[in-house]
Every structure is written in structure tokens, then in C-alpha cells.
């Protein structure tokens, strides 16, 4: 175009995709009338007329700007809607009268790409490969004009460096115009990068000045040679029998080595592999004394067949053999002594205490029980426990019972039950001694007993009431070799005046239950055990 | 002040041709653009183009192409709508309207054209 | 072509209410519209340009808004004189008229 040359430089309008661009003409009156202007757009020093101004009349010229023009600000400016990356070009308004003038406009088009995505290199990086491998690609997506990428590691910016870092960005043109760009990072890396953290930083521009989005931050996996393997045991601390135990190789290499666990034969002093589960850990459960002993682990690079021993360690699975308690099967006339001794192993040192089984009361700290001038109430379950202080839960118990001659003794000797006629009663009738009692009723009905203890037998009957037996009452007697004992079990209706609460009977329409529930002999004694304690 | 007198009111058979004037006074002729207007009865305002006044060069909304030509004569300050081969649907009241270059209108009385066999 | 769209045909108001008349157009115009008034009988009358320019002799109770796409006319304390059809008008790319609301006094 004659006189191009002189122009001075087009004026710069800024815009971002999909705004609207504000074309403002700028000659002066007197340099032409804006009521009589074309304008054009120029592409690749090709002017195409694009909207034309008459007597102040706008109007579009058929084309890709015909839909996105309108004139604006008294004829001298000319809008241009839904602005795209293929619009950034030079706009060219020229008027005609008193001469023939122009102005330029430079539109620049901008659009921030979209959040960077930033993908690792999943095959991870050996460290001693010969050049820079790929790391991890950045993409930004539907950016104009390009973005810049930076790399960064740990923070700080990622310089080129030969044969250590090198990028390599490439950009596609979508069909919209906008720019994806692609960004490999390829490097050397170190063990000491196993940990570093990478990001990638996209750069852009907008009219209101230059921005940058940051992606995620990812690690690479990086792979170098194991060079020491360890053992580490679970729980830490010490261990006793019926843990859960497990023992696993640990090494410094990635990826680990292959590993086996070996523990040392006691009798051949031999290293015998151990059979591990799918993760390579070996689990006791529950752990036995047998498993103590000296393990270590063997990790076997596949790639270079390099195999490397841990340190041997030492495992001690704690424990407390059975309880053995002397005499077994103790038997006393009353007024004698007894010795009770309890003897058990273990690989810490033994705590011993003896309880009495009714009532859990402690009766001694140690192995050995005396007791003298037994009564009859002294028969009945002693328990050794053998403790280990130093290791909560482990320990055994033996629990020996203690036999006192003697005639049955009744748990009680009278009791009134409240009937009614033709109902079923269940009764039932407790005594002990030793030899161990047997009992029998004086009434016909169904009869069963159970043992209860050594000691002690109960006995129940089914028997239907009725007036014969309303007469007579029940009675029940037990008897061993060295004599017999009675109770007695006294029958009265039910009616309304009579029916009071009683603690000892039940009664309902078919059932009636009577049980001892205090003794009837005066030197009975009886000990609840103590309430477990309450565990927040 | 400035005026646009319309000619009167036509009432024409189907096929005939009508041609409307709009007389100008008040303003220099050529400095303003000439606009026409179509309101059917009970209808709305459908612009039907332009003509400029400098070049005589019309400029015809997509509806009114064909039929319909405008015109001037510069020296009487008049501007012509001239509708060829009548139909029922002309039936309309037209205004002129003329426009400075900051937007601002002028409108004629409006002319009824009445077409019916 | 821009169409011009006014969603209201009829708007009823009182003497003193307020009242908006909205116009959108079809694509983006920005500030090139007008809006017109017409009585019976009567050629339209010019009451806002440039969207919200308000002609000269026009009460200031008219009032234009807008820009791009969306435009309104707001008439304050309406009075009965004011019972008649509004038109905008588009004129930043040829010009189209919008279909009209005509206004009723209850």
C-alpha cells in the first residue's frame, strides 16, 4: 500500500477470548468525516472491507465478521463481539472526505489456559541411566497466545543443564484457535530425589497484566540399589506367647530386593528359610517359645543376582509353661494341715499367687500354700497363678481341689414353699460332703442330680401337689459312708391373705422353684468374688 | 425547525404501482440519511432500509427487496418509496425518517396505503 | 439479522407507579439502541438514543438503561398521558425495531 511505510505504529487494543473488542477509530474530524468510513480487516497484508459507515449508518459486510459488528460511541467506534484467537489481527478504519486517511488497530487476543495437568513418568527413573530420562509432562490446555512453562523441583526454578536437565515443550493449534501446549521434563536423578517434589508453572498474559497457574505437586518413582536389608519385628517390645507376631525385611533400594526370611536350627546351628505370606512378611499367630530364636533376612536383587545379608536378630517369644500343683488330688480329715506347692518355667522371672476359687480372694504370694486345722468350709478350689510382672497377660493357672472328709452337710435344713393343688413343683435339694453325697426324696416324683462340684451334688424333683402330700411335706436325704442329713420342705397354699413376697420361692401357675440360697449350718461362710473393675 | 411532509393517503388495486413523497425542509438535504418505515394496521415498526442522500446508493432490509425503490430528487429536498405490483399485504401506513449522525430522528406524518380489490 | 425481542405485548401500570419495559437483543449491540413512543394517530416519537441519551423535550421521568444485550426504558410516576406503545430500536449493525408493549393505564 503506497505510504504504508510512514504509518506511524498501529495502536494496540487488548481483549480476552470471548469478550468484545472496542475499535475506536481515531481520526480526527479534520482528518476525514466518521459519518463516512470503511473499515477492514487486514490478514496477511490482505484488506477485506468488513463494515461500512454512510451518512452514519453502520452496516456489516457479508463475511465472518458480519454477525459481530455493530457501531457504537456516535459512529466512532466499532464493536466486535465474541472475540476469537483467529481475530488478533490488524483493523484498518478509513475515511474518505476532505482526503483519504487511516488508522490502524493492533487487536491482541488473550485467554488463561486451563488449570496445568501434570502427569509422572509411572515407569519411574533409574539412577544410573546415561542421560536425562523423562520425568513427568505438563499440559496446559486452551491457552492464547502460547503459555510459558517452568519446571520446578523442591521449589526451585529448573534451569536447561546439559546432559542433567532438559525440556522439551511442543504446542497443538485446536480447532478454536487456542493453543494446548505439552512440556516433557527430562532428567539425571539421584537417590536423593526420591522424595522431590515436582511442579510444573504455566506463564500467560491477560490484558490486566501477566499471570501463572501452578499444578499439583507429584513424586517420581525412582529406582536405585538396595545397599543394607534390616529386619524389623511387630509389635516392638516384648513379645509372649498367642501374639500376633510378624517379621518383616526392610531395604534401602527401590524396588526391594527379593526377599526370604531364614531362622537358625538351634540344634544344627543351620539358617532354615522361613515361610512367609504374599507381602513377604513372616507371621507367628499366635507365637509359640518355639519361635524364638535367631532370624535374618536375605534380599536378592533380581537384575544383578546381588545378594545382601541383614544383621541376625534375636527373637524372644516369652513364656510360662504348665502349672503343676502338689499334690493333684489332695484329701484331709478336719483338723489336719496341708502343704500345697506350685511350680511352673519361664523365660522371665515367676510371680506365684494362690486364690481361692469360690471367691477369688488372694490367700498367698508365693508357690507354697499351708493350711492348718481344716474345717469342712476349707473344702473347694485352690488356683496357683504363675505371673510373669514384667509382661501384662502372661501367665497359667492350675486349679486343685481339696477334699475334707466328712458326713453330707444340707445347704439348708427347713424351708416353707407356697403352692397351690394340682400344680407340678419343682424342687430342689443341695448338700455336700465327702465322700460325695447322694440324695434321695421321700415322695415318688421324677428325680435328677448333678454333680455340682467334688463335693457337691444337687438334686431336683418334679412331683404333682396334692392334698396327701400337702399333709406330709417333702423331705430329701443325702447320705455317704461316713453318715446322712435332712431337709425339709414345707408346703402351704397360696391364698390371697397368705401370698406374700418371699425371696427364696417362685411359684407360678405350673412351676415352683425352691433352691438353697443360704446355707443352714452356722459355720458356713460364703465370699463373693470382686466386681471386675469398669474400663473406659 | 425541521419537517418531512408526507403525500396522502393511496388506495390502489392489486398489480397497480403507488409512489409515496417526502418533502424536506429545515436541514440541509444531503447531511442526513433517509430512512423508511412500514406499520401494518395494528401492528408494529418494521424498518424497511435506507437511502443515502449524498449518492443516491439505497440500502434494502431483507423483506424489501424486489418491489419496493427509493429514490430522491436533491434538488426539491425529496425522497421517494415507490412499491411495484401491489398486493393485500402492503396495506400499511409508511414513514419517512430521517437521521443526523448522532441518532437523532425525524419522522414524516406517515402516508396510508390501501390496497383492495 | 439483529432481532430485537420486548417479551412483554402488554404492561398494565397505575398513575404514579413505576414501570420497565425491556428489550434484548439477538446478538451483542452495545449501546446503539433507541426507544421510541407512539399514541394513536400519530408518528413515533424519539425519547432515548445511544440507550440511554434522553431526547430533547422529553420529562425526565423517562429514563434508558443497558448495554450489549439487554436493555430497559423506565418510566417513573406514570402518568395517563403515558398510555401508549413503546418501540426500541437497534441501530448499531442496519437497524430492526423491536415488536412493541403497548402500556395501559388500570
Known amino acids: 500500500v503506497p505510504g504504508e511505510a510512514e504509518q506511524p505504529a498501529p495502536e494496540l487494543v487488548e481483549v480476552e477470548v470471548g469478550s468484545t473488542a472496542l475499535l475506536k477509530c481515531g481520526l480526527s474530524q479534520s482528518q476525514g468525516n466518521l459519518s463516512h468510513v470503511d473499515w477492514f480487516s487486514v490478514h496477511k497484508e490482505k484488506r477485506t472491507l468488513i463494515f461500512r459507515v454512510r451518512q452514519g449508518q453502520g452496516q456489516s459486510e457479508p463475511g465472518e465478521y458480519e454477525q459481530r459488528l455493530s457501531l457504537q460511541d456516535r459512529g466512532a467506534t466499532l464493536a466486535l463481539t465474541q472475540v476469537t484467537p483467529q481475530d488478533e489481527r490488524i483493523f484498518l478504519c478509513q475515511g474518505k472526505r476532505p482526503r483519504s486517511q487511516e488508522y490502524r488497530i493492533q487487536l491482541r487476543v488473550y485467554k488463561a489456559p486451563e488449570e496445568p495437568n501434570i502427569q509422572v513418568n509411572p515407569l519411574g527413573i533409574p539412577v544410573n541411566s546415561k542421560e536425562p530420562e523423562e520425568v513427568a509432562t505438563c499440559v496446559g490446555r486452551n491457552g492464547y497466545p502460547i503459555p510459558q512453562v517452568i519446571w520446578y523441583k523442591n521449589g526451585r526454578p529448573l534451569k536447561e543443564e546439559k546432559n542433567r536437565v532438559h525440556i522439551q515443550s511442543s504446542q497443538t493449534v485446536e480447532s478454536s484457535g487456542l493453543y494446548t501446549l505439552q512440556s516433557i521434563l527430562k532428567a539425571q536423578l539421584v537417590k536423593e530425589d526420591k522424595d522431590a517434589q515436582f511442579y510444573c508453572e504455566l506463564n500467560y498474559r491477560l490484558p490486566s497484566g501477566n499471570h501463572m497457574k501452578e499444578s499439583r505437586e507429584v513424586t517420581v518413582p525412582v529406582f536405585y540399589p538396595t545397599e543394607k536389608v534390616w529386619l524389623e519385628v511387630e509389635p516392638v517390645g516384648m513379645l509372649k506367647e498367642g501374639d500376633r507376631v510378624e517379621i518383616r525385611c526392610l531395604a534401602d533400594g527401590n524396588p526391594p530386593p527379593h526377599f526370604s526370611i531364614s531362622k537358625q536350627n538351634p540344634s544344627t546351628r543351620e539358617a532354615e528359610e522361613e515361610t512367609t505370606n504374599d507381602n513377604g512378611v513372616l507371621v507367628l499367630e499366635p507365637a509359640r517359645k518355639e519361635h524364638s530364636g535367631r532370624y535374618e533376612c536375605q534380599g536378592l536383587d533380581l537384575d544383578t543376582m546381588i545378594s545382601l545379608l541383614s544383621e541376625p536378630q534375636e527373637l524372644l517369644v516369652n513364656y510360662v509353661s504348665d502349672v503343676r500343683v502338689s499334690p493333684a488330688a489332695p484329701e484331709r480329715q478336719e483338723g489336719s494341715s496341708l502343704t500345697l506347692t506350685c511350680e511352673a518355667e519361664s523365660s522371665q522371672d515367676l510371680e506365684f499367687q494362690w486364690l481361692r476359687e469360690e471367691t477369688g480372694q488372694v490367700l498367698e504370694r508365693g508357690p507354697v500354700l499351708q493350711l492348718h486345722d481344716l474345717k469342712r468350709e476349707a473344702g473347694g478350689g485352690y488356683r496357683c497363678v504363675a505371673s510373669v510382672p514384667s509382661i501384662p497377660g502372661l501367665n497359667r493357672t492350675q486349679l486343685v481341689n481339696v477334699a475334707i472328709f466328712g458326713p453330707p452337710w444340707m445347704a439348708f435344713k427347713e424351708r416353707k414353699v407356697w403352692v397351690k393343688e394340682n400344680m407340678v413343683l419343682n424342687l430342689s435339694c443341695e448338700a455336700s460332703g465327702h465322700p460325695r453325697p447322694t440324695i434321695s426324696w421321700n415322695v415318688n416324683g421324677t428325680a435328677s442330680e448333678q454333680d455340682q462340684d467334688p463335693q457337691r451334688v444337687l438334686s431336683t424333683l418334679n412331683v404333682l401337689v396334692t392334698p396327701e402330700l400337702l399333709e406330709t411335706g417333702v423331705e430329701c436325704t443325702a447320705s455317704n459312708d461316713l453318715g446322712k442329713n435332712t431337709s425339709i420342705l414345707f408346703l402351704e397354699l397360696v391364698n390371697l391373705t397368705t401370698l406374700t413376697p418371699d425371696s427364696n420361692t417362685t411359684t407360678g401357675l405350673s412351676t415352683s422353684t425352691a433352691s438353697p440360697h443360704t446355707r443352714a449350718n452356722s459355720t458356713s461362710t460364703e465370699r463373693k468374688l470382686p466386681e471386675p473393675e469398669s474400663r473406659g | 425547525q425541521i419537517q418531512l411532509v408526507q403525500s396522502g393517503p393511496e388506495l390502489k388495486k392489486p398489480g397497480e404501482t403507488v409512489k409515496i413523497s417526502c418533502k424536506t425542509s429545515?436541514?440541509?438535504?444531503?447531511?442526513?440519511?433517509m430512512h423508511w418505515v412500514k406499520q401494518a394496521p395494528r401492528k408494529g415498526l418494521k424498518w424497511m432500509g435506507w437511502i443515502n442522500t449524498e449518492t443516491g446508493e439505497p440500502t434494502y432490509a431483507d423483506d424489501f427487496k424486489g418491489r419496493f425503490a427509493f429514490s430522491l430528487e436533491t434538488s426539491a429536498s425529496t425522497a421517494y418509496l415507490q412499491i411495484n405490483n401491489l398486493r393485500n399485504e402492503d396495506t400499511a401506513t409508511y414513514f419517512c425518517?430521517?437521521?443526523?449522525?448522532?441518532?437523532?430522528?425525524?419522522w414524516g406524518q406517515g402516508t396510508l396505503v390501501t390496497v383492495s380489490a | 439479522d439483529i432481532v430485537m425481542t420486548q417479551s412483554h405485548k402488554f404492561m398494565s401500570t397505575s398513575v404514579g407507579d413505576r414501570v420497565n419495559i425491556t428489550c434484548k437483543a439477538s446478538q451483542y449491540v452495545g449501546a446503539a439502541v433507541a426507544w421510541y413512543q407512539q399514541k394513536p394517530g400519530q408518528s413515533p416519537k424519539l425519547l432515548i438514543y445511544w440507550a440511554s441519551t434522553r431526547h430533547t423535550g422529553v420529562p425526565d421521568r423517562f429514563t434508558g438503561s443497558g448495554s450489549g444485550t439487554d436493555f430497559t426504558l423506565t418510566i417513573n410516576n406514570v402518568q395517563s398521558e403515558d398510555l401508549a406503545d413503546y418501540f426500541c430500536?437497534?441501530?448499531?449493525?442496519?437497524?430492526?425495531f423491536g415488536g412493541g408493549t403497548k402500556l395501559e393505564i388500570k
Open positions: 430500536q437497534q441501530y448499531g449493525n442496519y437497524r430492526t
Open positions: 429545515g436541514y440541509t438535504f444531503t447531511d442526513y440519511s
Open positions: 425518517v430521517s437521521y443526523d449522525y448522532d441518532a437523532v430522528s425525524y
